[in-house]
């Protein structure tokens, strides 16, 4: 009897009520593997979720988040509010990155600017709330025999535009 069920392909289930005949999954259900005793209920993408891939008899629906939100967790199990670049999401909503930190995405947290001097490098482009610092070649005083005229500016001064 077990062998009969193992013959049931994906998209069907082994119907015990019908002498283990392979029956198609009912509407809004699926089985992604063969030999299933039941079909699983299709996921419904509602509210902040939107359908990325419709449910079929052999595969579950896949959800995305509506505009202004992004997926979190395996298989987009949650939607989290987007913020702007240069911000991070806190309990009180979206807040600008503090001085010395940046976020170049609509999600995630603000991260500290790269400290170029830790690697003995100069600053080519200053950091902003939206962008990390860009480091460049080692300045003269850190590179024997090298030559520069003006030392690199500090990473960024408040109110200054990006370098």
């Amino acid at each position: 009897l077990q062998d009969l069920c193992s013959n049931c392909p994906a998209g069907t289930f082994c119907d015990n009520n019908r002498s283990q005949i392979c029956s198609p999954c009912p509407p809004n259900s699926f089985s992604s593997a063969g030999g299933q005793r039941t079909c699983d209920i299709c996921r419904q993408c509602k509210g902040v979720f939107k359908t990325r891939k419709e449910c079929s008899s052999t595969s579950n629906a896949e959800c995305d988040c509506i505009s202004g939100y992004h997926c979190l967790g395996a298989e987009c199990s949650m939607c989290e509010q987007d913020c702007k670049q240069g911000q991070e999401l806190t309990k009180k909503g979206c807040k600008d990155c503090c001085f010395g930190t940046f976020n170049d995405q609509k999600r995630g947290i603000c991260r500290p600017w790269t400290n170029c001097s830790l690697d003995g490098k100069s600053v080519l482009v200053n950091g902003t709330k939206e962008r990390d610092v860009v480091c460049g070649p080692s300045p003269a005083d850190l590179s024997p025999g090298a030559s520069s005229a003006t030392p690199p500016a500090p990473a960024r001064e408040p109110g200054h535009s990006p370098q």
């Epitope: 200053n126 962008r131 860009v134 070649p137 500016a153």
Partner: antibody
Framework: EVHLLESGGGLVQPGGSLRLSCAAS????????MGWVRQAPGKGLEWVSI????????YYADSVKGRFTISRDNSKNTLYLQMNSLRAEDTAVYYC???????????????WGQGTLVTVSS | DIQMTQSPSSLSASIGDRVAITCRAS??????LAWFQQKPGKAPKSLIY???SLQSGVPSKFSGSGSGTDFTLTISSLQPEDFATYYC?????????FGGGTKVEIK
């Protein structure tokens, strides 16, 4: 598409001055360091100077230090090279170039302008 | 200053040949090395940065390798448009320095 157009080259006498300009378009000018590289006739490439995105950091080759000044006007998307006390050995094609970076590090040149010829001769 | 020594200074090759150009730094520069191609009367064009990363739009027949002091630019199958002069540049430290160039000519 990034476009860099140099101007201001020409013939100048030894000891004279010249100011080169480089008009930039096709990218966020203030977000990139910029530089000048020169090439004497029939010779190789020689780095001249670099300026950071906001203009706060400047670096020069020893051969031009104290004579050349690099600057930029981010509101006009323009890079400059003021050249004073010019010498015969400064004769070269001067290229303006955007400084490339990947991730958080950079320092190579990409792309380059078409160049402007500076001839220092009496 | 970091000296960049390219070899050979010139080479003759045929269409379809595999060509390798080497660049040696006088001190370690990690992978802070770029390669450029220059054709007569034209501005240099960036091919490779970070020793081995292909610049956007550059054909994959160009490849770069190396780290520290020894670097190589390889053209897997030379085509007529590849006959040019090639330069390396270190951007590990100021002053930025270029190799003396390698002229690739038709045999």
């Amino acid at each position: 598409e990034v476009h860099l157009l140099e101007s201001g080259g020409g013939l100048v006498q030894p000891g004279g001055s010249l100011r080169l300009s480089c008009a930039a378009s096709g990218f966020t000018f203030s977000s990139y360091a910029m530089g000048w590289v020169r090439q004497a006739p029939g010779k190789g490439l020689e780095w001249v100077s670099i300026i950071g995105g906001g203009g706060g950091s400047t670096y020069y080759a020893d051969s031009v230090k104290g004579r050349f000044t690099i600057s930029r006007d981010n509101s006009k998307n323009t890079l400059y090279l003021q050249m004073n006390s010019l010498r015969a050995e400064d004769t070269a094609v001067y290229y303006c170039a955007k400084v490339g970076y990947s991730g958080t590090y950079g320092g190579w040149f990409d792309p380059w302008g078409q160049g402007t010829l500076v001839t220092v001769s009496s | 200053d970091i000296q960049m020594t390219q070899s050979p200074s010139s080479l003759s090759a045929s269409i379809g040949d595999r060509v390798a150009i080497t660049c040696r730094a006088s001190q370690g520069i990690s992978n802070y090395l770029a390669w450029f191609q220059q054709k007569p009367g034209k501005a240099p064009k960036s091919l490779i940065y970070a020793a081995s990363s292909l610049q956007s739009g550059v054909p994959s027949k160009f490849s770069g390798s190396g780290s520290g002091t020894d670097f190589t630019l390889t053209i897997s199958s030379l085509q007529p448009e590849d006959f040019a002069t090639y330069y390396c540049q270190q951007y590990n430290s100021y002053p930025l320095t270029f190799g003396g160039g390698t002229k690739v000519e038709i045999k």
